[in-house]
């Protein structure tokens, strides 16, 4: 049960982390004008990934695609990519895990295959997030540096009659829900990870249910004694101190939970 | 089609007190930034206030603190309520829609504040 | 505050001729976020209120005739009449859209010669 609970929550974890990471990648605000020096501005600036933007005070909003590729600053490029790989890997993680929940039933697919897409989703989940933490951070330090850069060209730049406003970005709202939702995709995959290790000691528990069934000479053994999962060396029965643990005996009692899980 | 009329001006002493009113027709002011431009006799024109989404207003900093933009969406109507006024605040007083590029594009006639003793 | 400059105070022109118009801002109206010079051009009849001609420097307002135009970017912009016509006897403003307060420039008379 407790797997089944990890499995499922680092899903739903994954799918909101996944969902922010597009709504981020989307957003026009990743960077916004830094109000500071001219709060009464009339003219508000921000800037997404793909284009940026105007809000007047008049009310109107216009905003321009970036439409060339080869004139864009490299660092902008990386963003772009990463946020791309992290949507695509956690899109398909997301398609993985589906059929390797533990509450879906898809003909005779055992446990072990679910226990390694479960797996398999996890890790993709985590690079997910990872890439989206990676692209919101690069692009937050970027804003740092010519945060800083036009801050000195303003101070620095007016010799002579005119001066020219520069306009400083500061961070916009796409980076918090960036950070959030690679945070959310990343621990969303570790869950999943987890639900993994706990995923194939019961595919064992299963045959090992079947096999014992036919008999009638097995002994109560109390406590929560379950046969080795395989993974090591260690073949002999091992007491596992977990909650979710049930005894051979429970399992017995129920071999038809098995058949609708 | 478009109409702003604007009306309450007249003559005042100086530290008096005048509201002045813009009423639209054919347009809901409520759903556009709006503003307050006078002009002096025989002088240029000065933007005087701006009430823009939200209710956030701005003011010229000689009328900061004395004058107060408003608006009233049932009756359709801006305001501009102009206390302390002094001689140098006489003027055609003129309320305009903003749009596009901040642009002021819809004018009334304007109502004229003379402050004088 | 910005400070918008316009030259001339007074201009006068014959029918048929050019008309320029310059106005200079102390500092720029260039937004980075869709690159529009935020600046419009007014005209003003005697006894009549503004009437907006120009708007994002060069975008012509509908209905105006197409013999105004309006050029420049940054800080230095020009309003041109290409073929002075006699309605066109009037005062013209330019004004920043950029930063509050809106300012406007102090006009300049455009007469007929």
């Known amino acids: 049960m407790a797997v089944t609970a990890c499995q499922g929550l680092g899903f739903v974890v994954s799918l909101i982390g996944i969902a922010g990471i597009i709504a981020a990648t989307c957003m026009d605000q990743w960077s916004t004008q830094d109000l500071y020096n001219n709060p009464v501005t009339a003219v508000f600036n921000y800037q997404g990934l793909w284009r940026s933007c105007v809000r007047e005070s008049s009310g109107f909003t216009e905003c321009r695609g970036y439409f060339t590729l080869l004139g864009l600053p490299a660092m902008l490029q990386a963003v772009r990519a990463l946020m791309i790989v992290g949507i695509v890997l956690g899109a398909i993680g997301l398609l993985v895990s589906i059929f390797a929940l533990k509450c879906i039933r898809i003909g005779s697919m055992e446990d072990s295959a679910k226990a390694n897409m479960t797996l398999t989703s996890g890790i993709m989940f985590i690079v997910s997030g990872l890439c989206a933490i990676a692209g919101v951070s690069v692009f937050a330090n970027m804003l740092v540096t010519n945060f800083w850069m036009s801050t000195a060209n303003m101070y620095t730049g007016m010799g002579g009659m005119v001066q020219t406003v520069q306009t400083r970005y500061t961070f916009g709202a796409a980076l918090f829900v960036g950070w959030v939702a690679g945070g959310l995709t990343l621990i969303g995959g570790v869950m999943m990870c987890i639900a993994c290790r706990g995923l194939a000691p019961e595919e064992t528990n299963y045959k090992a249910v079947s096999y014992h069934a036919s008999g009638h000479s097995v002994a109560y053994k109390p406590g929560g004694f379950k046969a080795s999962t395989g993974f090591g060396s260690n073949t002999k029965n091992k007491k596992i101190y977990d909650g979710g643990a049930r005894t051979e005996d429970e399992v017995q009692s129920y071999p038809s939970k098995h058949d609708y899980v | 089609e478009v109409q702003l009329v604007e009306s309450g001006g007249g003559l005042v002493q100086p530290g008096g007190s005048l509201r002045l009113s813009c009423a639209g027709s054919?347009?809901?002011?409520?759903?556009?930034?709006m503003s307050w431009v006078r002009q002096a006799p025989g002088k240029g024109l000065e933007w005087v206030s701006s009430?823009?989404?939200?209710?956030?207003?701005y003011y010229l900093d000689s009328v900061k603190g004395r004058f107060t933009i408003s608006r009233d969406n049932a009756k359709n109507t801006l305001y501009l309520q102009m206390s302390s006024l002094r001689a140098e605040d006489t003027a055609v007083y003129y309320c305009?829609?903003?749009?596009?590029?901040?642009?002021?594009?819809?004018w009334g006639q304007g109502t004229l504040v003379t402050v004088s003793s | 505050d910005i400070v918008m400059t316009q030259s001339p105070d007074s201009l006068a022109v014959s029918l048929g001729e050019r008309a320029t118009i310059n106005c200079k801002s102390s500092?720029?109206?260039?937004?980075?976020?869709?690159?529009?010079?935020?600046l419009t051009w007014y005209q003003q009849k005697p006894g009549q209120p503004p009437k907006k001609l120009i708007y994002?420097?060069?975008t012509r307002e509908s209905g105006v005739p197409d013999r105004f135009s309006g050029s420049g970017s940054g800080t230095d912009f020009t309003l041109t009449i290409s073929s002075l016509q006699a309605e066109d006897l009037a005062v013209y403003y330019c004004?920043?859209?950029?930063?509050?307060?809106?300012?406007f420039g102090q006009g300049t008379k455009l007469e007929i010669k």
């Open positions: 305009a829609r903003k749009y596009h590029g901040n642009a002021l594009d819809y």
């Open positions: 054919g347009i809901t002011l409520s759903t556009y930034a």
């Open positions: 009430i823009i989404s939200g209710g956030i207003t």
């Open positions: 500092q720029s109206l260039l937004s980075s976020g869709n690159q529009r010079n935020y």
């Open positions: 994002w420097a060069s």
């Open positions: 004004q920043s859209n950029y930063f509050y307060p809106l300012t």
